[in-house]
Amino acid sequence: MVPEEEPQDREKGLWWFQLKVWSMAVVSILLLSVCFTVSSVVPHNFMYSKTVKRLSKLREYQQYHPSLTCVMEGKDIEDWSCCPTPWTSFQSSCYFISTGMQSWTKSQKNCSVMGADLVVINTREEQDFIIQNLKRNSSYFLGLSDPGGRRHWQWVDQTPYNENVTFWHSGEPNNLDERCAIINFRSSEEWGWNDIHCHVPQKSICKMKKIYI
Amino acid sequence: LGEPQLCYILDAILFLYGIVLTLLYCRLKIQVRKAAITSYEKSDGVYTGLSTRNQETYETLKHEKPPQ
Amino acid sequence: LGEPQLCYILDAILFLYGIVLTLLYCRLKIQVRKAAITSYEKSDGVYTGLSTRNQETYETLKHEKPPQ
């Protein structure tokens, strides 16, 4: 017959078991606490660094855009898309109608100092949006030019010029010396593009990507 | 990793931990219940069995007549 | 409430749930071990007693000679 275990040993074994179990519990709780702390502290730091990043990003724009109008993108409170306050937004871009009259080069320069370019029109929907804000008796420079005068039209942002997505007035472009494009209103055809001399001052349309903060 | 992503990952870890521990807890609880029932049956059976066995023995002793 | 806020609330709930369940599980584990030890001690007595008693019965039966 196996000699019987002493109650003292049995108690000792139970005590060791208890110690092991509670140690496991403490380790588990510690791990959970670490997880929870990470979940609470890291996002706080992340939020802080994100805020710092946002502020520096906003500071970049502040020189020319002292105030931004922002809308929440999707459901996430973190994602805001902004346009400078007087600008209008459409899809992923912001638009500004410059009422000052300038040559094409100056108009492009004017847009660029605001962190934008002369407008590049990619779709009919985009043009339809833009024309809502234009005056019928004015002409506006587009970011489209033919620097060599050889009918190789190019957009300022290097977007490929697609003949199928152009909205020239009938008979335009019609002059090799007219190397810059404007959008204007003609009673017969409504809004469309025309080629003109680049040095003649016109109003213009600037376009920039939305600012995401 | 973005802030929400981190939160969701930790959510998932805590959630899995909760599920695993819930299952372990339930399994242990069931084992305890089973053990209790088994233990009850066993202890019952020991005494019942004993009494029966004794009874049988007794009966046998009682009814078994020696050859005369 | 925003999505991230909800996530943190869920985090807190799961965290507390995890802690409570960890404690419950560990307590149950120890209870089971204690119960096993207690049960072991008890069952040990039962079987020892039985075995002795059977032995005695057996011996009694064995040595008890019928009258001739």
């Epitope: 100056k106 003109i196 003649v200 | - | -």
Partner: antibody, heavy 120, light 107 residues
Framework: DVQLQESGPGLVKPSQSLSLTCSVT?????????WNWIRQFPGNKLECMGY???????YYSPSLKNRISITRDTSKNQFFLNLNSVTTEDTATYFC?????????????WGQGTLVTVSA | DIQMTQSPASLSASVGETVTITCRAS??????LAWYHQKQGKSPQLLVY???SLVDGVPSRFSGSGSGTQYSLRINSLQPEDFGSYYC?????????FGGGTKLEII
Amino acid sequence: DVQLQESGPGLVKPSQSLSLTCSVTGYSITSAYYWNWIRQFPGNKLECMGYITYDGNNYYSPSLKNRISITRDTSKNQFFLNLNSVTTEDTATYFCARGGDYDDGGFAFWGQGTLVTVSA
Amino acid sequence: DIQMTQSPASLSASVGETVTITCRASGNIHNYLAWYHQKQGKSPQLLVYNAKSLVDGVPSRFSGSGSGTQYSLRINSLQPEDFGSYYCQHFWIVPYTFGGGTKLEII
């Protein structure tokens, strides 16, 4: 070489209209550039009044918008200034000039100017 | 409108001297500045465009400089034909306004 020449009455009565002509030679006003009217007051201050572009569009200085009109006669290669309701304040030397040279960086070609006095 | 402030209003110098005329814009005109010289009874003549580019035929003693809102015209070794009035004009955005002028006189 392009040349510009202003012409018109040297004396205009207050409340009347001032009309001037700029005749351009050596370049067609419908080919390119924009064609300006500029005036210089007796104190030598210079003011851009407005222009007509090669394709016939106009720009007028905001301070003159209600009184000014710039037109052209393409067959004669001339453009015109009309200023209504003149006062003695409109006494000045009136110049025409071509705009758009040097990528619109300066007026390279000017007329010799014509003095207009507004007086009763 | 962008306002142009020119200084000094008048300046006296002798032949061979060097003079500097300054022009301040009320806003950034991004180097779109022209300088003119006008003699009594004549029309202004373009000397400098885009702040520092000299028109063909203009003597190299004339030089333009500056950026943003501050610009200047420097005339080295003054010649008798350089006397008269000087005007700056910005070409950044219509209307293209002129400075008040600087009258350069001979001593």
